[in-house]
């Protein structure tokens, strides 16, 4: 099975690597522009140079290309707690990340928010916090895990999942209540 190619990929595949087909003359292969530059004018003929210009401030191209415009630099989303790890250069987009002791929660493919790593109070660290995953906690006896925090079994209601984990405590509470009424 041949993978489906778009028109641009079809045109490029006729030329050797690092070159592309002249849009007005399919017998000419022009050299692609280096990263950090963009296509200003196609090469006038075979063996002649493509006119490539450097990206202006605030834009970039990260790979060889024949784009008519550079791509706009991404901005880190402060409202999502993101910080700039490295600023945009002509050949590399801005790199955004989170502060120390934070992890990324991806809302969608290109959108993440920074959250503080759980400290596992009233529990122990089962798996350390990672770039894209919160700490995994194991709770001490008398506590259960709710939204990755160890909560006292005294906050466990019968309808919740915690009843299995807190069963001995619940039974003890019932026992003391019963003995108090006799």
């Amino acid at each position: 099975l041949v993978p489906h190619l778009g028109d641009r990929e079809k045109r490029d595949s006729v030329c050797p690597q690092g070159k592309y087909i002249h849009p007005q003359n399919n017998s000419i292969c022009c050299t692609k522009c280096h990263k950090g530059t963009y296509l200003y004018n196609d090469c006038p003929g075979p063996g002649q140079d493509t006119d490539c210009r450097e990206c202006e401030s605030g834009s970039f191209t990260a790979s060889e290309n024949h784009l008519r415009h550079c791509l706009s630099c991404s901005k880190c989303r402060k409202e999502m707690g993101q910080v700039e790890i490295s600023s945009c250069t002509v050949d590399r987009d801005t790199v955004c990340g989170c502060r120390k002791n934070q992890y990324r929660h991806y809302w969608s493919e290109n959108l993440f928010q920074c959250f503080n790593c759980s400290l596992c109070l009233n529990g122990t660290v089962h798996l350390s916090c990672q770039e894209k995953q919160n700490t995994v906690c194991t709770c001490h006896a008398g506590f259960f895990l709710r939204e990755n925090e160890c909560v006292s079994c005294s906050n466990c209601k019968k309808s919740l999942e915690c009843t299995k984990l807190c069963l001995p405590q619940i039974e003890n509470v019932k026992g003391t209540e019963d003995s108090g009424t006799t």
Epitope: H105, W107, S108, E109, N110, L111, F115, E147, N148
Partner: nanobody, 120 residues
Amino acid sequence: EVQLLESGGGLVQPGGSLRLSCAASGFTFTRYSMGWVRQAPGKGLEWVSFIDPPSVHTYYADSVKGRFTISRDNSKNTLYLQMNSLRAEDTAVYYCAKISQFGSNAFDYWGQGTLVTVSS
């Protein structure tokens, strides 16, 4: 077919409260993060709040932090937005939206919207 149906909008006085609901159908609700987006008259779209499927992660715009609370009931396929201490600047059409897992757009489906008017 994905459907998102908002309700609960209306006219409220400054300082008042409203609770918006969004009934979702046509997809597995428990698999997707959901959100509320609003558009004030003559303004662009503003992200208001997001919530992930287990209700562990939430996002609030600075303009609504401490006043609005997002929640969801996965057993009822319903998303909520509790809005307290409403201000005139909260006047907008509020849209319930399904967050896209892939691609460059944050949302892939929207409801028709419900109008919230804050006025004395």
